[in-house]
Amino acid sequence: NQDLPVIKCVLINHKNNDSSVGKSSSYPMVSESPEDLGCALRPQSSGTVYEAAAVEVDVSASITLQVLVDAPGNISCLWVFKHSSLNCQPHFDLQNRGVVSMVILKMTETQAGEYLLFIQSEATNYTILFTVSIRNTLLYTLRRPYFRKMENQDALVCISESVPEPIVEWVLCDSQGESCKEESPAVVKKEEKVLHELFGTDIRCCARNELGRECTRLFTIDLNQTPQTTLPQLFLKVGEPLWIRCKAVHVNHGFGLTWELENKALEEGNYFEMSTYSTNRTMIRILFAFVSSVARNDTGYYTCSSSKHPSQSALVTIVEKGFINATNSSEDYEIDQYEEFCFSVRFKAYPQIRCTWTFSRKSFPCEQKGLDNGYSISKFCNHKHQPGEYIFHAENDDAQFTKMFTLNIRRKPQVLAEASASQASCFSDGYPLPSWTWKKCSDKSPNCTEEITEGVWNRKANRKVFGQWVSSSTLNMSEAIKGFLVKCCAYNSLGTSCETILLNSPGPFPFIQDN
């Protein structure tokens, strides 16, 4: 085995980025760091066979299987997959190692299987075997995290019952509002399950695995904030845990906090208090209200009171099933070519939704923003002034919701003409939908003012192109107009556009556009 080359097998996972999808270059995408696949010599096999560690790939993921060969001289190679040979083009890296790559774009079931790479070097021949399978994500789950109190300690544990085991992190922020956005410098992340520092302004726990990332915010009433116009509302499903934190800061320790549900004090064991002095020697108190598994009768107004602050309440609603509340009637919009415009959907939902915006069979990411009144809003502005049908789709564990929008762009008609031996047709996509006139150009009417009304057939909006209506008008040829120039004109409130057609030429017809 003295002559065997030193080989390395690696897997490169690619992050799909829009611009590269569908291109099949050797290095199509932004890639993550290569993962070593081992490539051990397979014992008891005829010939020299290396076997790479099995590769599991998500559906639609893009990967590169790569072999690095440290052997003198040139190499030639051949890939074989399901008895078909595939082209193989080795090249050399900066360390003069032979590099052979197989790019798999957008993994599908048909691309799973054994990939054999035959390599011939000056010294020896050998085979490398890769087994690629699709990861069975049907068994995967990602559940929203929830909180539990740590036994005998003033600390919260964050739990997410997910497969595979998720990475759990606390996301903490001590500013107000916008500065608590995920990538803000005010945000601190702690990759641990237990949190002891519970005095922060904004506390969230997030769980992530192969399916994505889910977060739960610790619902908080801050008595130092001016009471909101809209009472905060918290939805939970039967059996879920309830956690509400009441927080207050005062110049000294001479105040206490209490929780009440519908004017009755919470039972012992359904709350716990913590206090600390802040850097400026003011006292911070927090009082947690919690129920380990809610029932319908835990619905109601939870009020936090203090002797030194205005009381504030939250309405807790326990539901049997999740929901998405929004108006699903379709909406039509008409805008100018350069007008700024966004579609928007206002909804109330529990649990939080996952959503997409779709246009012309292409999906766009969907962002949602919480409003003060318990509703959320999703906006879509990236329509690039393309007319057509836009679809908002939202779903959670228990409900689905779809809303249709139509976008019309006001513009002057553009006319296209075509003709055959028996008729001439004109098409236009202007909006509002144009009306049509046909005119005959003759010695009597050199300016083409003689209107043709016989044999004209208008079809309004006869076909949809990505939701964009197209209007057409057809003129049946008669002896009276054969050999003449005719002009079709489409007009709407924004202008007129015409095409001139000669009605006696066989074969391709000459068209003259005049606007």
Partner: nanobody, 111 residues
Framework: QVQLQESGGGLVQPGGSLRLSCAAS????????IDWYRQAPGKQREWVAQ???????FYADSVKGRFAISRENAKNTVYLQMNSLKPEDTAVYYC?????WGQGTQVTVSS
Amino acid sequence: QVQLQESGGGLVQPGGSLRLSCAASGVTFSINYIDWYRQAPGKQREWVAQITRDSNSFYADSVKGRFAISRENAKNTVYLQMNSLKPEDTAVYYCRVLSYWGQGTQVTVSS
């Protein structure tokens, strides 16, 4: 069905006084805290004052020392005594219990 009814609004000169009332039916006032809010034309509704079940009172900075909130549990009514009124106090004044709001009463401070 909870119903709140405000009254006592009107037109008053700067420096003058008004006493607003908020009467409730369908809810026991004595066991709840009550808030007064106001909304000036073209502005968002803002919190003005609160009286708790134990008759502790709290005020927004803009009205502290000029307004006084009180309650009469037997009549299921809360009052807002407004003194030294300023033009910027012009607004519709609302009372609120939990999620329930009254229709509001107009206060105009103008010479």
